[in-house]
C-alpha cells in the first residue's frame, strides 16, 4: 500500500551500462529488471540518481569487476559512492577495495556499498571506479539503487 | 510502531541450512536469530520467500563460500538472487562472482548481495550458487532476507 | 516527511574511528557524513548503537581491511555484527570471512554485512573483527549503521 | 555467434532411454531459459519441455509429463534431457532452443535453434 500522497514510496534500482567513455563514472540504465519508483527520483544522463525530496534514504551500490594483479596497476579496484549537492562539491560517501586477483586472464570480483544518508533536494548520488574497463555488465553483475526511508 | 492493520510491516531474514540435495538453488531455516514478521511472508520449501502482498521491497542475501583454485572449476564462485513470480521462468535479480582462493585447504570469502525490487503477489525469490557444497553454515555467514517499504 | 511524533524516523550511520585499544570491538564516531536522528538511537562508548525502541531494523556493516596472508595467522580476516541485549550475553548476528591476500605489503579486501532484525529497548548493536589493526580507516572505508523499519 | 550442438540421439528400443545434449556457446547461457523441440517424420514442430536460466522453473509437454526431465549444468554451458520410457510416437529428430529473452512465459518465442538430433524409437 503507498504511503498516500503526501508521502510516497521512493526508490531506484538501475542497471549497468557499458560505456565508450573513458570516465571512471559508471553509467547505469532503466532496463531489465529496474525500478523508478515516481518521478520523485530520476536517472539523469546515466549516471547520477537524482532526488526531488529532502530526507533520509539508504543508497546502494554492487559492482563486480575482472581484473588481474599483472595486467593492472599495483593500486586496488576501488568503488566510490559519491555525493554532490547543488552548489558544492562532490563528496565521497563510501569506499570499498579489492587487490587485483592473480587468476588469468582475469579474476572475477563483486563489491557492496551501502548506508544510510540526509539527502537534500536536488542532491544526486553516483557511483566511480577506478577502472570502469573492468567492471562486469553481465546480467545483474553491477547495479545501484536507493530508497527513502 | 506497527503501520496498523492496513499496511503492516512485511520482514523475513532467515539462516542458512546445510543439505544434501544436489540442488544448487541454497537452503533456509527459521532458526537461530531469525525474522518472519507474519504471514505476508513465508518461507517455502526451505529454499524460497514468497510474498503475498504487492509493492516494493529491499531484497539481500549474504553468503559465505570456502574454496581453492585447484580443486574448483576454471569458473568463479557465482550466487544469484533470482525471482520465480507465477506462471513464468525464474529471473536473475542480483549476481555476484568471487574467483576462487589459492589458500589450502580452501579460502573462505563473502559475497554481499541486495536490491530494490516489485514484487507480485505469490511471487518468490531464491539463491542459486554455482557450488552448495562450498558454502558455509556457521553461525551469521550465510544468511537470506527481505523488507517491504 | 518525518512519519509523525508518533513513529519518527530513526537511523544512524557512523564512521570508523582508529584505536590504541587492543579491543578487537571497531570504534566509531559522529564524523564526516554520519547520520544520527534523534535520540532514540545512540552512538555509545564510540563502540555501539544503542536504540530505545522495540521493533524490526535493518543493521549493517562495511569494513575494509588490508593484509597479508605470510604476516597474518593462518585464519582468515572475520568480521562480525553482535547484539547484546540488556542481561544477557552478546550473540552474532551476522559475519563475513575473506582470507587474507598474497599481495605485499598487504592487499584491501571490503566485507559488507546487512540484515533484518529485532531489537529490543535498550538493545546494542556493535561490529568485532579478527585484527582491527588491519582495518582501513580512509574516508568511506569502514561504516556502521541501521535504520527502523 | 550464438552455437547449439546437440548429441546423444540414436537407436533405441520401446521402454528405453536416451539423454541428449546441448552444449551452448556464444552467449552468456546462464541467463537464458532454454528448451527442447521436435519433428517427427511428416510432422510439424511440437514443444517438448523448457527450463528457466537456473533450473527452478521446468515446464514439459503433456505427452512426455513423467518420462523425460529436462536440466543443465551452468559451469558446463551444456542443456540435457533424460528421455525414459521412450516410445515409438517419440521417433523424432530434437533440437536444442534458446529463448530470445531472459525471463518470461514458457510458450514465448526462441531465438536461436541447433541442428537436431536423431532419437529412432524402433523394436
Known amino acids: 500500500m503507498q504511503k498516500g500522497d503526501q508521502n510516497p514510496q521512493i526508490a531506484a534500482h538501475v542497471i549497468s551500462e557499458a560505456s565508450s567513455k573513458t570516465t571512471s563514472v559508471l553509467q547505469w540504465a532503466e532496463k531489465g529488471y529496474y525500478t523508478m519508483s515516481n518521478n520523485l527520483v530520476t536517472l539523469e544522463n546515466g549516471k547520477q540518481l537524482t532526488v526531488k525530496r529532502q530526507g533520509l534514504y539508504y543508497i546502494y551500490a554492487q559492482v563486480t569487476f575482472c581484473s588481474n594483479r599483472e595486467a593492472s596497476s599495483q593500486a586496488p579496484f576501488i568503488a566510490s559512492l559519491c555525493l554532490k549537492s547543488p552548489g558544492r562539491f562532490e563528496r565521497i560517501l563510501l569506499r570499498a577495495a579489492n587487490t587485483h586477483s592473480s587468476a588469468k586472464p582475469c579474476g572475477q570480483q563483486s563489491i557492496h556499498l551501502g548506508g544510510v544518508f540526509e539527502l537534500q533536494p536536488g542532491a544526486s548520488v553516483f557511483v566511480n571506479v577506478t577502472d570502469p574497463s573492468q567492471v562486469s555488465h553481465g546480467t545483474g553483475f553491477t547495479s545501484f539503487g536507493l530508497l527513502k526511508l | 510502531m506497527q503501520k496498523g492493520d492496513q499496511n503492516p510491516q512485511i520482514a523475513a531474514h532467515v539462516i542458512s541450512e546445510a543439505s544434501s540435495k544436489t540442488t544448487s538453488v541454497l537452503q533456509w531455516a527459521e532458526k537461530g536469530y531469525y525474522t518472519m514478521s507474519n504471514n505476508l511472508v513465508t518461507l517455502e520449501n526451505g529454499k524460497q520467500l514468497t510474498v503475498k502482498r504487492q509493492g516494493l521491497y529491499y531484497i539481500y542475501a549474504q553468503v559465505t563460500f570456502c574454496s581453492n583454485r585447484e580443486a574448483s572449476s576454471q569458473a568463479p564462485f557465482i550466487a544469484s538472487l533470482c525471482l520465480k513470480s507465477p506462471g513464468r521462468f525464474e529471473r536473475i535479480l542480483l549476481r555476484a562472482a568471487n574467483t576462487h582462493s589459492s589458500a589450502k585447504p580452501c579460502g573462505q570469502q563473502s559475497i554481499h548481495l541486495g536490491g530494490v525490487f516489485e514484487l507480485q503477489p505469490g511471487a518468490s525469490v531464491f539463491v542459486n550458487v554455482t557450488d552448495p557444497s562450498q558454502v558455509s553454515h556457521g553461525t551469521g555467514f550465510t544468511s537470506f532476507g527481505l523488507l517491504k517499504l | 516527511m518525518q512519519k509523525g511524533d508518533q513513529n519518527p524516523q530513526i537511523a544512524a550511520h557512523v564512521i570508523s574511528e582508529a584505536s590504541s585499544k587492543t579491543t578487537s570491538v571497531l570504534q566509531w564516531a559522529e564524523k564526516g557524513y554520519y547520520t544520527m536522528s534523534n535520540n532514540l538511537v545512540t552512538l555509545e562508548n564510540g563502540k555501539q548503537l544503542t536504540v530505545k525502541r522495540q521493533g524490526l531494523y535493518y543493521i549493517y556493516a562495511q569494513v575494509t581491511f588490508c593484509s597479508n596472508r605470510e604476516a597474518s595467522s593462518q585464519a582468515p580476516f572475520i568480521a562480525s555484527l553482535c547484539l547484546k541485549s540488556p542481561g544477557r550475553f552478546e550473540r552474532i548476528l551476522l559475519r563475513a570471512a575473506n582470507t587474507h591476500s598474497s599481495a605485499k605489503p598487504c592487499g584491501q579486501q571490503s566485507i559488507h554485512l546487512g540484515g533484518v532484525f529485532e531489537l529490543q529497548p535498550g538493545a546494542s548493536v556493535f561490529v568485532n573483527v579478527t585484527d582491527p589493526s588491519q582495518v582501513s580507516h580512509g574516508t568511506g572505508f569502514t561504516s556502521f549503521g541501521l535504520l527502523k523499519l | 555467434e550464438v552455437q547449439l550442438l546437440e548429441s546423444g540421439g540414436g537407436l533405441v528400443q520401446p521402454g528405453g532411454s536416451l539423454r541428449l545434449s546441448c552444449a551452448a556457446s556464444?552467449?552468456?547461457?546462464?541467463?537464458?531459459?532454454m528448451g527442447w523441440v521436435r519433428q517427427a517424420p511428416g510432422k510439424g514442430l511440437e514443444w517438448v519441455s523448457s527450463i528457466g536460466p537456473v533450473g527452478m522453473s521446468t515446464y514439459y509437454a503433456d505427452s512426455v509429463k513423467g518420462r523425460f526431465t529436462i536440466s543443465r549444468d551452468n559451469s558446463k554451458n551444456t542443456l540435457y534431457l533424460q528421455m525414459n520410457s521412450l516410445r515409438a510416437e517419440d521417433t523424432a529428430v530434437y533440437y536444442c532452443a534458446k529463448y530470445g529473452g531472459t525471463s518470461g512465459r514458457h510458450n514465448t518465442k526462441f531465438d536461436y535453434w541447433g541442428q537436431g538430433t536423431l532419437v529412432t524409437v524402433s523394436s
Open positions: 556464444g552467449f552468456t547461457f546462464m541467463d537464458y531459459p
